[in-house]
Protein backbone atom coordinates (compact mmCIF):
# COMPACT_ATOMS: atom_id res chain seq x y z
CA UNK A 1 0.00 0.00 0.00
CA UNK A 2 1.41 3.18 -1.38
CA UNK A 3 1.47 5.88 1.28
CA UNK A 4 2.40 8.88 -1.04
CA UNK A 5 4.80 11.20 -1.98
CA UNK A 6 6.99 12.15 1.04
CA UNK A 7 5.83 15.41 2.38
CA UNK A 8 9.23 16.28 3.12
CA UNK A 9 12.23 16.86 0.81
CA UNK A 10 13.64 13.41 0.43
CA UNK A 11 16.22 13.98 -1.60
CA UNK A 12 19.41 15.92 -0.84
CA UNK A 13 22.45 16.46 -3.24
CA UNK A 14 26.14 16.78 -2.59
CA UNK A 15 29.57 16.14 -3.71
CA UNK A 16 28.19 13.79 -6.71
CA UNK A 17 25.80 12.03 -4.10
CA UNK A 18 22.50 12.11 -3.07
CA UNK A 19 21.31 11.81 0.47
CA UNK A 20 17.95 10.08 1.09
CA UNK A 21 15.61 10.60 3.81
CA UNK A 22 13.91 8.52 5.20
CA UNK A 23 11.18 9.64 8.30
CA UNK A 24 9.67 7.82 10.81
CA UNK A 25 7.80 8.80 13.60
CA UNK A 26 9.30 9.85 17.46
CA UNK A 27 7.64 7.09 19.18
CA UNK A 28 8.61 4.48 16.92
CA UNK A 29 11.36 2.70 18.94
CA UNK A 30 12.08 -0.89 16.64
CA UNK A 31 11.92 -0.39 13.03
CA UNK A 32 12.91 -2.02 9.96
CA UNK A 33 13.57 0.89 6.89
CA UNK A 34 14.13 -0.54 3.26
CA UNK A 35 14.79 1.64 0.67
CA UNK A 36 13.64 0.96 -2.98
CA UNK A 37 14.65 1.63 -6.01
CA UNK A 38 11.59 0.61 -8.08
CA UNK A 39 10.39 -2.54 -6.73
CA UNK A 40 14.13 -3.79 -6.19
CA UNK A 41 15.71 -3.39 -2.44
CA UNK A 42 18.85 -1.20 -2.09
CA UNK A 43 19.38 -0.62 1.57
CA UNK A 44 17.78 -1.51 4.64
CA UNK A 45 18.38 -1.12 8.51
CA UNK A 46 16.94 -2.77 11.28
CA UNK A 47 16.54 -0.89 14.89
CA UNK A 48 15.81 -3.11 17.65
CA UNK A 49 16.20 -2.96 21.68
CA UNK A 50 17.08 -6.06 23.58
CA UNK A 51 16.88 -6.68 27.14
CA UNK A 52 18.18 -3.63 29.47
CA UNK A 53 17.10 -1.43 25.97
CA UNK A 54 20.37 -2.56 24.12
CA UNK A 55 19.80 -0.93 20.87
CA UNK A 56 20.95 -3.23 17.89
CA UNK A 57 21.32 -2.22 14.58
CA UNK A 58 21.83 -4.01 11.56
CA UNK A 59 21.84 -4.20 7.38
CA UNK A 60 20.97 -6.84 5.14
CA UNK A 61 22.04 -4.80 2.07
CA UNK A 62 24.44 -2.26 3.53
CA UNK A 63 24.71 1.08 2.07
CA UNK A 64 26.50 3.65 3.99
CA UNK A 65 23.34 5.23 6.32
CA UNK A 66 22.89 7.55 8.77
CA UNK A 67 20.37 6.90 11.60
CA UNK A 68 18.96 9.75 13.80
CA UNK A 69 15.56 9.60 16.47
CA UNK A 70 13.50 10.19 13.67
CA UNK A 71 15.03 9.26 10.52
CA UNK A 72 17.32 7.05 8.60
CA UNK A 73 19.56 8.78 5.72
CA UNK A 74 20.72 6.53 3.48
CA UNK A 75 23.63 7.82 0.78
CA UNK A 76 24.07 6.56 -2.72
CA UNK A 77 27.42 8.13 -4.19
CA UNK A 78 29.02 8.55 -7.65
CA UNK A 79 25.18 9.78 -9.53
CA UNK A 80 25.22 9.06 -13.43
CA UNK A 81 21.39 9.32 -15.37
CA UNK A 82 20.58 5.07 -14.58
CA UNK A 83 19.95 6.62 -10.83
CA UNK A 84 17.23 8.58 -12.24
CA UNK A 85 13.63 6.41 -10.53
CA UNK A 86 11.28 6.50 -7.87
CA UNK A 87 12.59 5.68 -4.65
CA UNK A 88 10.73 4.63 -1.48
CA UNK A 89 11.07 4.54 2.24
CA UNK A 90 9.31 0.98 3.52
CA UNK A 91 8.93 1.33 6.68
CA UNK A 92 7.98 -1.19 9.06
CA UNK A 93 7.52 -0.74 12.55
CA UNK A 94 7.45 -2.96 15.32
CA UNK A 95 7.19 -0.89 18.46
CA UNK A 96 4.78 0.11 19.67
CA UNK A 97 2.50 -2.34 18.72
CA UNK A 98 0.70 -2.98 16.07
CA UNK A 99 3.02 -4.03 13.40
CA UNK A 100 2.32 -1.08 10.62
CA UNK A 101 3.88 -0.50 7.10
CA UNK A 102 3.99 3.01 5.54
CA UNK A 103 5.26 3.33 1.82
CA UNK A 104 6.24 6.87 0.96
CA UNK A 105 8.48 8.05 -1.94
CA UNK A 106 9.40 10.24 -4.80
CA UNK A 107 11.22 10.44 -8.36
CA UNK A 108 14.65 11.06 -8.34
CA UNK A 109 15.44 13.69 -11.21
CA UNK A 110 19.43 13.84 -12.50
CA UNK A 111 20.38 16.87 -13.46
CA UNK A 112 24.31 17.25 -14.57
CA UNK A 113 24.91 19.98 -12.24
CA UNK A 114 24.56 17.11 -9.74
CA UNK A 115 26.41 14.42 -11.60
CA UNK A 116 29.62 12.95 -9.95
CA UNK A 117 31.83 13.19 -12.82
CA UNK A 118 31.11 15.69 -15.43
CA UNK A 119 32.99 15.93 -18.45
CA UNK A 120 34.11 19.99 -18.48
CA UNK B 1 -13.88 -20.39 7.39
CA UNK B 2 -11.97 -18.01 8.81
CA UNK B 3 -13.19 -18.70 12.50
CA UNK B 4 -11.91 -17.73 16.40
CA UNK B 5 -13.61 -19.52 19.09
CA UNK B 6 -12.70 -18.56 22.78
CA UNK B 7 -13.25 -20.65 25.48
CA UNK B 8 -12.52 -21.18 29.32
CA UNK B 9 -14.06 -18.58 30.90
CA UNK B 10 -16.30 -18.32 34.01
CA UNK B 11 -17.39 -17.17 37.42
CA UNK B 12 -13.95 -17.31 39.97
CA UNK B 13 -13.70 -15.80 43.35
CA UNK B 14 -11.26 -12.73 43.76
CA UNK B 15 -7.81 -13.68 43.81
CA UNK B 16 -8.31 -16.80 41.40
CA UNK B 17 -7.09 -18.19 38.07
CA UNK B 18 -8.44 -18.85 34.90
CA UNK B 19 -6.75 -19.79 31.65
CA UNK B 20 -9.01 -18.78 28.32
CA UNK B 21 -8.25 -20.52 25.12
CA UNK B 22 -9.04 -19.20 21.34
CA UNK B 23 -8.98 -21.94 18.31
CA UNK B 24 -8.47 -20.89 15.00
CA UNK B 25 -8.88 -22.47 12.01
CA UNK B 26 -9.35 -21.33 8.21
CA UNK B 27 -5.89 -19.70 8.05
CA UNK B 28 -2.47 -19.82 8.65
CA UNK B 29 -2.38 -19.25 12.48
CA UNK B 30 1.34 -18.81 12.76
CA UNK B 31 1.44 -15.92 10.15
CA UNK B 32 -0.76 -13.62 12.16
CA UNK B 33 -0.37 -11.11 14.67
CA UNK B 34 -3.11 -12.21 18.10
CA UNK B 35 -4.74 -10.13 20.63
CA UNK B 36 -7.20 -10.28 23.35
CA UNK B 37 -9.36 -7.69 24.02
CA UNK B 38 -12.35 -7.44 26.69
CA UNK B 39 -15.54 -5.10 27.32
CA UNK B 40 -17.11 -4.89 30.60
CA UNK B 41 -20.73 -5.42 31.22
CA UNK B 42 -22.62 -2.09 29.55
CA UNK B 43 -19.02 -0.81 28.47
CA UNK B 44 -16.31 -0.15 26.14
CA UNK B 45 -13.90 -2.25 24.33
CA UNK B 46 -10.48 -2.07 25.60
CA UNK B 47 -7.00 -3.96 24.72
CA UNK B 48 -6.03 -6.80 26.84
CA UNK B 49 -2.56 -7.89 25.45
CA UNK B 50 -0.94 -8.84 22.08
CA UNK B 51 2.07 -11.07 20.37
CA UNK B 52 3.81 -11.07 17.29
CA UNK B 53 3.98 -13.71 14.78
CA UNK B 54 7.34 -14.97 14.51
CA UNK B 55 9.60 -13.86 17.22
CA UNK B 56 6.19 -13.67 19.75
CA UNK B 57 7.19 -10.72 21.44
CA UNK B 58 4.40 -9.40 23.99
CA UNK B 59 2.78 -6.43 25.44
CA UNK B 60 -0.05 -6.01 27.98
CA UNK B 61 -1.89 -2.77 29.56
CA UNK B 62 -0.64 -1.86 32.47
CA UNK B 63 -3.45 -2.82 34.22
CA UNK B 64 -2.70 -6.53 33.67
CA UNK B 65 1.08 -6.49 33.80
CA UNK B 66 2.35 -8.96 36.23
CA UNK B 67 -1.12 -11.24 36.42
CA UNK B 68 -1.71 -11.83 33.05
CA UNK B 69 0.37 -14.02 30.34
CA UNK B 70 -0.64 -14.38 26.90
CA UNK B 71 1.10 -17.16 24.70
CA UNK B 72 0.14 -19.05 21.79
CA UNK B 73 0.69 -22.88 20.01
CA UNK B 74 0.97 -22.97 16.55
CA UNK B 75 1.14 -26.38 16.35
CA UNK B 76 -2.16 -26.45 18.26
CA UNK B 77 -3.62 -23.25 16.27
CA UNK B 78 -4.36 -21.76 19.67
CA UNK B 79 -3.83 -18.30 21.25
CA UNK B 80 -3.89 -18.42 25.43
CA UNK B 81 -5.04 -15.75 28.13
CA UNK B 82 -3.65 -17.18 31.60
CA UNK B 83 -5.34 -14.81 34.36
CA UNK B 84 -4.12 -14.73 37.78
CA UNK B 85 -4.69 -12.64 40.65
CA UNK B 86 -8.20 -12.04 39.47
CA UNK B 87 -9.72 -9.04 40.83
CA UNK B 88 -13.57 -7.75 40.48
CA UNK B 89 -12.57 -5.18 37.91
CA UNK B 90 -11.81 -8.02 35.62
CA UNK B 91 -15.28 -8.69 34.88
CA UNK B 92 -15.61 -8.71 31.00
CA UNK B 93 -16.54 -10.41 28.11
CA UNK B 94 -12.81 -11.72 26.40
CA UNK B 95 -12.45 -11.58 22.95
CA UNK B 96 -9.52 -12.73 20.80
CA UNK B 97 -8.55 -10.87 17.64
CA UNK B 98 -6.57 -11.66 14.27
CA UNK B 99 -5.04 -8.20 13.58
CA UNK B 100 -5.19 -7.59 9.66
CA UNK B 101 -1.82 -9.13 7.44
CA UNK B 102 -0.66 -6.42 5.80
CA UNK B 103 0.14 -4.17 8.39
CA UNK B 104 -2.31 -2.08 7.79
CA UNK B 105 -4.07 -2.49 11.19
CA UNK B 106 -7.81 -3.08 12.04
CA UNK B 107 -8.76 -6.57 14.14
CA UNK B 108 -10.55 -8.74 11.18
CA UNK B 109 -11.28 -11.23 12.70
CA UNK B 110 -13.04 -11.70 16.28
CA UNK B 111 -14.13 -14.84 18.36
CA UNK B 112 -17.57 -14.53 19.89
CA UNK B 113 -16.07 -13.90 23.49
CA UNK B 114 -16.06 -15.85 26.27
CA UNK B 115 -17.67 -14.40 29.77
CA UNK B 116 -15.05 -14.15 32.90
CA UNK B 117 -17.28 -12.97 36.42
CA UNK B 118 -14.88 -12.29 39.46
CA UNK B 119 -16.90 -12.16 42.51
CA UNK B 120 -17.23 -13.52 45.83
CA UNK C 1 -1.58 7.30 26.69
CA UNK C 2 -3.62 8.38 23.44
CA UNK C 3 -7.30 9.41 24.13
CA UNK C 4 -10.21 8.91 21.60
CA UNK C 5 -13.31 10.86 22.00
CA UNK C 6 -16.01 9.44 20.22
CA UNK C 7 -19.24 12.23 19.42
CA UNK C 8 -21.94 11.71 19.60
CA UNK C 9 -22.74 9.50 22.41
CA UNK C 10 -25.96 8.24 21.26
CA UNK C 11 -27.69 9.52 17.60
CA UNK C 12 -31.50 8.79 16.73
CA UNK C 13 -32.00 8.44 12.81
CA UNK C 14 -34.34 6.90 10.60
CA UNK C 15 -33.86 4.35 7.70
CA UNK C 16 -32.14 6.10 4.80
CA UNK C 17 -30.75 9.08 6.68
CA UNK C 18 -27.32 9.90 6.26
CA UNK C 19 -25.38 9.92 9.52
CA UNK C 20 -22.09 11.30 10.41
CA UNK C 21 -20.16 9.85 13.89
CA UNK C 22 -16.79 12.10 14.59
CA UNK C 23 -13.48 10.28 16.56
CA UNK C 24 -10.78 12.80 18.06
CA UNK C 25 -7.92 11.91 19.31
CA UNK C 26 -5.91 13.74 21.74
CA UNK C 27 -2.82 13.91 19.49
CA UNK C 28 -2.42 13.08 15.76
CA UNK C 29 -2.53 9.68 14.83
CA UNK C 30 -1.88 10.11 11.07
CA UNK C 31 -4.07 7.90 9.92
CA UNK C 32 -3.82 4.61 11.86
CA UNK C 33 -7.36 4.58 12.88
CA UNK C 34 -10.37 1.41 12.56
CA UNK C 35 -13.86 2.05 12.97
CA UNK C 36 -16.11 -1.11 14.18
CA UNK C 37 -20.11 -2.21 14.35
CA UNK C 38 -20.89 -3.88 17.35
CA UNK C 39 -24.33 -5.50 18.13
CA UNK C 40 -25.82 -6.35 21.46
CA UNK C 41 -24.11 -9.49 22.68
CA UNK C 42 -21.80 -9.70 19.60
CA UNK C 43 -18.17 -9.51 18.65
CA UNK C 44 -17.39 -6.20 16.79
CA UNK C 45 -17.23 -6.10 13.45
CA UNK C 46 -14.81 -4.37 11.41
CA UNK C 47 -16.07 -1.74 8.82
CA UNK C 48 -12.79 0.62 8.32
CA UNK C 49 -8.89 0.58 8.26
CA UNK C 50 -6.44 2.67 7.95
CA UNK C 51 -8.88 5.70 8.20
CA UNK C 52 -10.87 5.34 4.82
CA UNK C 53 -9.97 1.91 3.59
CA UNK C 54 -12.82 -0.17 3.04
CA UNK C 55 -13.23 -3.75 4.88
CA UNK C 56 -14.01 -6.39 2.33
CA UNK C 57 -17.33 -7.43 2.33
CA UNK C 58 -18.29 -4.60 4.09
CA UNK C 59 -21.12 -1.97 1.84
CA UNK C 60 -20.15 1.12 0.34
CA UNK C 61 -22.45 2.78 2.36
CA UNK C 62 -19.86 3.15 4.89
CA UNK C 63 -17.27 5.45 4.18
CA UNK C 64 -14.46 7.17 6.52
CA UNK C 65 -12.43 10.06 6.14
CA UNK C 66 -9.85 12.39 8.30
CA UNK C 67 -6.18 11.78 9.57
CA UNK C 68 -3.98 13.30 12.12
CA UNK C 69 -6.54 14.42 15.15
CA UNK C 70 -10.02 14.26 13.34
CA UNK C 71 -11.89 11.40 11.68
CA UNK C 72 -15.29 10.69 10.81
CA UNK C 73 -17.79 7.64 9.65
CA UNK C 74 -20.19 8.10 7.26
CA UNK C 75 -23.30 6.46 6.72
CA UNK C 76 -24.62 7.44 3.30
CA UNK C 77 -28.35 6.44 3.59
CA UNK C 78 -29.16 4.14 7.08
CA UNK C 79 -30.34 0.53 6.66
CA UNK C 80 -32.75 -1.52 9.29
CA UNK C 81 -29.55 -3.76 10.01
CA UNK C 82 -27.15 -0.75 10.75
CA UNK C 83 -28.74 0.07 14.20
CA UNK C 84 -26.08 -0.75 16.49
CA UNK C 85 -22.52 0.95 18.47
CA UNK C 86 -20.39 2.11 16.35
CA UNK C 87 -16.75 2.32 17.97
CA UNK C 88 -13.12 4.18 17.08
CA UNK C 89 -9.98 2.68 17.53
CA UNK C 90 -6.60 3.75 17.07
CA UNK C 91 -3.47 2.23 16.42
CA UNK C 92 -0.76 4.66 16.18
CA UNK C 93 0.76 3.48 19.34
CA UNK C 94 -0.95 0.40 21.50
CA UNK C 95 -4.86 0.48 20.93
CA UNK C 96 -7.46 2.80 22.15
CA UNK C 97 -11.19 3.01 21.36
CA UNK C 98 -13.90 5.22 21.71
CA UNK C 99 -16.60 5.33 24.28
CA UNK C 100 -18.91 4.08 21.38
CA UNK C 101 -21.77 5.81 19.33
CA UNK C 102 -25.09 4.18 19.89
CA UNK C 103 -27.41 5.04 16.57
CA UNK C 104 -31.02 4.64 17.69
CA UNK C 105 -34.17 4.52 15.55
CA UNK C 106 -35.87 7.72 15.80
Known amino acids: EINGSANYEMFIFHNGGVQILCKYPDIVQQFKMQLLKGGQILCDLTKTKGSGNTVSIKSLKFCHSQLSNNSVSFFLYNLDHSHANYYFCNLSIFDPPPFKVTLTGGYLHIYESQLCCQLK | QVQLVESGGGLVKPGGSLRLSCAAS????????MNWFRQAPGKGLEWVSYISSGDGTIYYTDSVKGRFTISRDSAKNSLYLQMNSLRAEDTAVYYCARDRLTGTGGMDVWGQGTTVTVSS | DIQMTQSPSTLSASVGDRVTITCRASQSISSWLAWYQQKPGKAPNLLIY???SLESGVPSRFSGSGSGTEFTLTISSLQPDDFATYYCQQYYSYWTFGQGTKVEIK
Open chain 3, 50 to 52: KAS
Open chain 2, 26 to 33: GFTFSDYY
